[in-house]
Structures are given as C-alpha cells and as structure tokens.
Interface confidence: low
C-alpha cells in the first residue's frame, strides 16, 4: 500500500487539515483548567489529572490510552518539621529564619497542598557553620576560590546563586569542595529583569519568590533505586545508601529578600571580580564567614524532608499506523508540577493535548497516519526525569527496535521573542522546511514565515541566512530516548532574546508565581506563540509519521562532525608538547569524519532515486535513516556514566541542561594539566578518540549500500 | 552470603605506620559505601572512617581523632577497603571493624596494637 | 559531636522475662539510629536500624522504637543467647558516634 492509499487524501492536504485544526482559544482553555490546582507528583491531585487526560484522549478518538504506574523514589518536606536556615549567635540562639513559604499569589490565598520551596532529596541535617559565597557555584568558579584565592570551603556552608548551569552540578560541586551544606538563592541580577515589576503586577520574580527543583546528579539512572531497570511490582530496590546520585550535603533555596540577611553580613574576601557580583545592595564577600561585629554568628540549616518510595503514573495514547504500525513516533512531555505549572510544564501539557485533538479529529474522518504515533503525558519529570525514564526502561526492546523520533513537549513558552529549536542533526532540515510552511506570530513579521522571524532574531553562528538550532543536552523528558536509546529527539518552544535579557531561564521558574495569569497577562495573552508551537511540534510530529521517506538527513549530521572534532582537536592542541610526548593523534577521527561524508553523501543520491513504490526497498532505506541515530550509541556508555551512551552528543559534566558534543574527549581533556598522572590522562584521550573514530565509521557503514 | 573478612593487624611501634586490608564478597561491592569502624575496651566503639561509592565521587569521611593520619581507599575491581595509618599512638589500639553501610554487615576484625 | 548515652550500663534478667533498653542522643537525630548485638568473641551484628526498622533475619521478639532524642529497644521474652552487650549507634551526621554499651546478664 502506498501512503495516499492509506490515509484517502493526500499528504500535504491531510498537514493541512491537520495544521488548521489546531486553535489558540483551545490550548487557552486547556491551560487554565491544568493549573487551577497543584499537582506534584506522587499526589491524588495528579492521579485525577492523568485520569483526567486519559479519559479526554479516549473523547479525542486516540486507539487506546493506558496509564502505566511506578514506584519511585520522590522527595517531600516534613509537614510538621519545615525546612529554614537561620543565623544564630554565639549562645546558639536563632537571630534570624528564612521564611517558611512564598506569600500565595492574588486569587490562590485559600489553595491547600502549595508545597513549600524545598531541594528535592536533600538528605535531612542542620549543619551549622561559617558561609562562603561560590557564585554560581561552577567548576569554573570552584577553580576561583581554591586555586586563586586559596579558600577552603571544606566543612563550610556555602551559599550560590541560581543560573547558568543545571542546580544538581552546583550541589555535585560544592560536595566534592568539602561543604557541609548549600544554599541555593535567586539573585536579582539573575531573575529580575530590569524595567519590568515583579509579580502580580509584572513577570518578575518578588523578593519572596523562590526556585524549587531536585538536586540529583543521576545521569539518565531514572529512579534512584532501580537504574536500569523499570520501578515495577517486582523490582528489585537498592537501599537508599545505594541510591544513585542523591545529594550527601543538606541543601535548601531561598529568595533573594533572604539571601539580602546572609549575605550583607558576610566578609572575608572581596568578590574576585566584577562577574561574581550581582544587583542585591550586598558587598558579594566570599568570606568565610560573617565580618567584624557578627563574626561569632554562624548560619545553622534545618532540613527535615524525606525520601519516600511512592507511585507515580504516565498516560500513554496510541493512534496505530496504518501502513507501518511497528514504527513509532513518539510526542511526550511532562504533566507534574511543582505548583501551578502555569509555563512548566502545563503551557507544554496544554499544546500536546490540542495536538491529540487534532489528530484525533482527522482520525475520525476516516484518516491515520502511515506509522504509530504515540502520546505521552509523563510524571515526575521534575523528581529527575523518572515517569519517561521508567517507561522507557519497561519498553527498551520495543523502542531500540520501533523508535523513529521522539519530540519533547516541555513548556512551550520561556519569553515571546522567538524560536528555539534544540535537535538531532537529522531533523535540521525538517525544521527549516516545517517552519518555511508556518506564518510567524511576530510584530513586525505579518505575512512572513516563522523560518524568516526566527533566522532574523536568531541567527545560526555558522551559517548566514539560517537559523540557529541548538545540541540537545539534558534536563528534560528526551533524555532516556536520545542519550540512552539512540532515538532522533527534538524539541522547540518560544524564548526570550537572549541578547537583551541575560537572566537565566524565566524569573518566575519553580515559583508558586507561575500561574495561569502569569501566561494570559504578560506572556502570551492571544495564545498566539502557544499555537505557533503547536504547529511546530505537530508538525515534526505529522511529517515524522507520515512521510513515505523519513524527513531525515544524513548529510547534516556529516556537517556536524566535521564542526565538532575540529573543535576537540582545537581543544586538545592547547597542550601540543603533551600531543607530541604522547603520540596523540585525531587523524583516525577525521578519516571516520571523512569517511562518514562521503558516504552519506551516496546514501541521499540513492535516497533521490529509488523505488519508492517499491515497500521492501522502502522500508530498508527507511530503517537506515531511523538506526542512523542508533548506530551513534556505545553499549558501554560514557566513562562513569553508563546511561550516557550517544558517543556524539551528552550533557555536560559541568551542566546537565548544556549538550556537549565528543563528550568523552571532552571530558578525557578537561583540566588534563592538573592531573597527578599525566601518562594516564593522555591516554585516556587517545582511548576516547579510538571510541569515537570507531563510532563514527561504524555509524557510517550502517549506511553503505547492503549488499 | 555477604561476608567481610579484614587481615593485616599487628603489632607496630609509635610513630610507625600499617595498613589493613578488608575483602568483601556476596554482594555487589562497588555499589557500597564502606566504613572502618574500631573498638576498645576502654572507650567502645568509634567510628574512624568512611569512604562512598563510585557515583559519590568516592567521597571520604573521617573522624576527628584520626583526621590526617589515616587514609580510607578501596578498590571496586578487588572488592577491597583499605586503612593507611600513619604516625600510630597507644591510643589507636583496637580491633578494626571493617562494615558495609549503614553499619549492616561487620567483619570479624583485625587487632591493631600501637606499643614500644 | 553527637554524644549517645545508653542506660542501664548492665541489667541482669531470667530467660521468658521482657527486657527494655534506652538510648539517649545529646541532639535530635531524628530515626537514623541502629541497635547492635555483640557477643563475647565476636563482631557486632545489627540488630534494628532506622529506629524501629528490624534488620534481616532478626527474631521478631525485637524491637525498636523512638525518633529524635530518647530511643528504645525491647526484647518481648528474653532467650539465653541475648544475654550479650548491646549498643546503639547514630548515622545522622558525622562522625557516626555509638553509645557505650548495655551488657545484659543472667539474673
């Protein structure tokens, strides 16, 4: 059967249809029912919802939606033993307590079960000791402190402010520094943008608002007592000493109102530098410990949360393939906040459930796609990505088998400037011809394409007149697909210019602030952004299951690894004596690079000319493009990081939510001057260039003519 | 069966140096975190060390009392846990508990006696 | 540091009588506290941990019981062979300190 056979009307008609059935006023009136209440995961409030959706997608007209359930490991304050630091004196008295809640937003006075900020899965503790400010508490900064500045924060508390680099690789940091505990604040200069008022009245973030969010360095483990393996009846649970990735060192956010008490006492060292300063009326002294008069006060923490073993529940939504039902797109994004959600994540929720409702319609005119398209509402991504890691982990065989793409559907909104695209190489050229077909939503750009919008306020670096489209790193729901399983994964969303606004990610993140009217009132109040990202996400999503030939190509990603192993090579000749001593050599890299070009090269002439009528050629032409990405995986993964496996791409070891690219180079390199063995290190880099020079032409030949 | 059996104890003068050894097995060694733990019949028992897993960046912990004159290390690949002392005193003399976390399993011991 | 006071030093009683001992943390521990057995040659073993939690394949005549400062550990019907040392031991911050024992004797 052909494509048009099985779907009775014609490909771009049915993305037509499909694209025109996607309206604003919907995904306005989803969201607002998403975030009326709470819904953390592991509580009813969140069984209703998934209940809630199940039985709407079934409305919709999708074959069939199950909620498949775990247990987990989450993490949740002590009701009747709340979490604060204090600054005590020299008797031990508390002189000063951070609060114990954010004041509710107007309208959400009377909400029960708001959880208070917290750190998920600090461990439980009161610490007491000096403070010593580390920034943004990066490697980078660490490196600051103890080798320039020659401070010790062993046995110390420290304190960071929030940004630039994913909070677990913060608390990861400060541990392996010595602290005996951490403190996490928002700093104005970070989430307050200048010129705008904070919340109610404007999209910053207020003195008493604060950042909720886990704290784990699993590295794609997925529940920390089952890595590998689903958290299912039968599973077999490590002892929580065994766990993987929890924090050691109490930790606990505050707001910057807070953060003002503990840091305007602080002395010590002067800040090194003017980065190390942000906009609170504060000296930014390192310290340790407090200046002059308050020497004798230390800050004491009291952390009482638990770790608790509790069920959790994805909704999971099939539409079966008419023609190649054993292929799987897969659309998924989180459904768990830890308030509101009002951006994150239910501004995601709401367009994946208007996506349902338009596939859903076509469907019951008698429509399907050529291959399965799986939705998926997940839980506790916010607990360390574990609803989607778990079911990933129950249906690794399926997937690493059926898996053509995954898109993620996280917020679809972080500011209303334009696009941002994170993706495989194979999906660039997908994205830019979707994005050709769209209009943009933008002032100033009626009448013309989102591809012309975003290429303007976003320009790709490299290449003139393209957009920019970023490495995917980690942080979200794609993780388990790319990283560990070797499916092509995408996503995209509305963002902020980056150029103007430096503050990391949106002010009001985490917050109990992040509300409905946060998103109708200062984001997006015509729900056009929101829709022009359904159209996106819908979009990949159609073409992915519906092309006769995948809408990937191969060539993009030879572009790439040209772009990357000049770039580790660059890196890596920072140090040519230590090349030299060490016969380091990349030329085994860029032969595979080389190699890999010209062969995909051949592959997409073939690609051009076969017989396209023909369903066994098709198809095998097909599986080369869907296990391209696969072939990219190592079964023994990344140096201590076994679930990190993509040899081309991983989130930082300095930055969970960064992508870094040759990842095992990369790390093989990284401070290599400071290591005690130098011999050792050198060859640590030659065995990871071997890795992926061997990756890469393997990968290669996965697209050679079979015979 | 998970067994811990510790072996290197001795006699040794003040000042002197020894290192004791601890081999696990019945049970995936790498995953644990390991103490050193000792006992005398004057002050019971003292925890002297602790070091944690691979995916806790092997930190190490250690009592006050021994604090910069021992060193926790293991090695996963031999299912060990070793303690280097160095510049021993009478005080330190006791049986050497070699446990899994927290504190579960115990080895036998091995006696460490610091005297001229 | 954490200071753990057990009480009594030593108690002496009959085999089938019920035996109570207590531990006293100088600071909120919170149930991160563990019961231990020692017999006389021998290394301790753990008998409860997580305050009231009972470790594998210990009889079910012990128990524990307690959270923050003051906890208990009871034996129902007291056996010839408890008639050992006991200590308690906290892992709630470093160091991990243990009481001074309990020795129970043959009354």
């Known amino acids: 059967k052909s494509s048009n056979e099985a779907t009775n009307i014609t490909p771009k008609h049915n993305m037509k249809a499909f694209l025109d059935e996607l309206k604003a006023e919907n995904i306005k009136k989803f969201l607002y029912n998403f975030t009326q209440i709470p819904h953390l995961a592991g509580t009813e409030q969140n069984f209703q919802l998934a209940k809630q959706i199940q039985s709407q997608w079934k409305e919709f007209g999708l074959d069939s939606v199950e909620l498949a359930h775990y247990d987990v490991l989450l993490s949740y304050p002590n009701k009747t033993h709340p979490n604060y630091i204090s600054i005590i004196n020299e008797d031990g008295n508390e002189i000063f307590n951070t609060s114990l809640f954010e004041p509710p937003p107007p309208g959400y006075e009377n909400v029960s079960d708001i959880v208070p900020p917290f750190s998920a899965f600090s461990p439980q503790g009161m610490p007491e000791g000096d403070l010593v400010y580390v920034n943004y508490a990066r490697t980078e900064d660490f490196f600051k402190l103890e080798r320039d500045m020659k401070i010790n924060c062993s046995g110390k508390i420290v304190i960071a402010r929030y940004g630039k680099v994913f909070r677990g690789n913060k608390v990861k940091n400060a541990q392996l520094a010595g602290a005996k505990g951490v403190i996490l604040y928002s700093d104005p200069a970070d989430y307050f943008a200048p010129g705008v008022k904070s919340y109610p009245d404007g999209w910053n973030l207020p003195g008493g608002g604060v950042q909720r969010g886990n704290i784990l360095n699993l590295n794609g483990a997925g529940d920390p007592l089952t890595p590998g393996y689903p958290a299912n009846e039968y599973a077999y649970r490590r002892g929580i000493a065994e766990a993987v990735g929890l924090p050691s060192i109490p930790v606990h956010p505050i707001g910057y109102y807070d953060a003002q008490k503990l840091l305007e006492k602080m002395g010590g060292s002067a800040p090194p530098d003017s980065s190390w300063r942000g906009s609170l009326k504060v000296p930014y002294n390192v310290g340790p410990g407090f200046t002059g008069n308050f020497s004798t006060q230390k800050v004491k923490m009291h952390i009482h949360s638990t770790n608790e073993v509790t069920r959790i529940y994805n909704v999971i939504g099939t539409l079966r393939g008419a023609v190649e039902p054993d292929r799987y797109v897969i659309l998924g994004g989180h459904r768990d906040s830890w308030v509101f959600g009002g951006i994150d994540p239910q501004s995601g929720a709401a367009v994946v459930h208007e996506i349902v409702r338009s596939f859903g319609t076509l469907k019951k005119e008698g429509w399907r796609p050529r291959r399965t398209i799986l939705f998926a509402s997940w839980d506790a991504e916010e607990f360390g990505l574990l609803g989607s890691t778990e079911w990933a982990e129950e249906n690794s065989r399926l997937l690493q088998e059926r898996g053509v793409a995954y898109i993620n559907a996280d917020s679809s909104i972080e500011g209303n400037y334009t696009l941002r695209v994170d993706c495989t190489p194979l999906m660039y050229s997908l994205v830019h011809n979707l994005t050709k077909e769209l209009k943009s939503p933008d002032e100033g750009f009626e009448g013309k394409s989102l591809y012309e919008s975003w290429t303007k306020k976003s320009p790709s670096p490299e290449f003139s007149g393209m957009p920019r489209i970023s490495k995917l790193g980690s942080g979200n729901d794609f993780e388990v697909f790319f990283q560990r399983l070797g499916i092509a994964s995408g996503r995209a969303r509305y963002t902020k210019n980056w150029e103007t606004n430096k503050f990391s990610g949106y002010p009001l993140y985490h917050s109990v602030y992040e509300t409905y009217e946060l998103v109708e009132k200062f984001y997006d109040p015509m729900f056009k952004y929101h829709l022009t990202v359904a159209q996106v996400r819908g979009g990949m999503v159609f073409e992915l299951a519906n092309s006769i030939v995948l809408p990937f190509d191969c060539r993009d990603y030879a572009v790439v690894l040209r772009k990357y192993a000049d770039k580790i090579y660059s890196i890596s000749m920072k140090h040519p004596q230590e090349m030299k001593t060490y016969s380091v050599s990349f030329d085994s890299l860029f032969s595979a690079v080389k190699n890999f070009t010209e062969i995909a090269s051949k592959f997409s002439e073939r690609l051009q000319d076969f017989d396209k009528s023909n369903p066994i050629v098709l198809r095998m032409m097909n599986d080369q493009l869907m296990f391209l990405e696969r072939a990219f995986i190592d079964p023994l993964g990344l140096p201590d990081r076994p679930f990190y496996r993509h040899v081309i791409y991983a989130p930082s070891s300095h930055n969970k939510y960064a992508g870094e690219s040759f990842p095992g180079i990369y790390d093989a390199l990284f401070d290599i001057e400071s290591k005690v063995d130098p011999s050792k290190a050198w060859g640590e880099v030659k065995r990871q260039i071997y890795v992926a020079a061997f990756t890469v032409q393997a990968a290669a030949e996965t697209l050679s003519e079979v015979a | 069966e998970v067994k811990l059996e510790e072996s290197g104890g001795g006699l040794v003068q003040p000042g002197g140096s020894m290192k004791i050894s601890c081999v696990a097995s019945?049970?995936?060694?790498?995953?644990?975190?390991m103490n050193w733990v000792r006992q005398t019949p004057e002050k019971g028992l003292e925890w002297v060390a602790e070091?944690?897993?691979?995916?806790?960046?092997?930190?190490?912990h250690y009592a006050e009392s021994v604090k910069g004159r021992v060193i926790i290390s293991r090695d996963d690949s031999k299912s060990s846990v070793y303690l280097q002392m160095n510049s021993l005193r009478a005080e330190d003399t006791a049986v050497y508990y070699c446990?899994?976390?927290?504190?579960?399993?115990w080895g036998q011991g091995t006696t460490v006696t610091v005297s001229s | 540091n954490i200071v753990m006071t057990q009480s009594p030093k030593s108690m002496s009683a009959s085999a089938g009588e019920r035996m109570t001992l207590t531990c006293k943390a100088s600071?909120?521990?919170?149930?991160?506290v563990s019961w231990y057995q020692q017999k006389p040659t021998q290394s301790p073993k753990m008998l409860i941990y997580?305050?009231?939690n009972r470790f594998t394949g210990v009889p079910d005549r012990f128990s524990g019981s307690g959270s923050g400062t003051d906890f208990i550990l009871t034996a129902s019907s007291v056996q010839a062979e408890d008639l050992v040392d006991y200590y308690c031991?906290?892992?709630?911050?470093?160091?991990?300190?243990f009481g001074g024992g309990t020795k129970l004797e043959m009354k």
């Open positions: 997580g305050a009231s």
């Open positions: 031991g906290q892992s709630y911050t470093f160091p991990y300190t």
């Open positions: 070091i944690r897993s691979q995916s806790n960046n092997f930190a190490t």
């Open positions: 019945g049970f995936t060694f790498s995953n644990y975190w």
């Open positions: 600071e909120n521990v919170g149930t991160y």
């Open positions: 446990t899994r976390r927290w504190n579960n399993f």
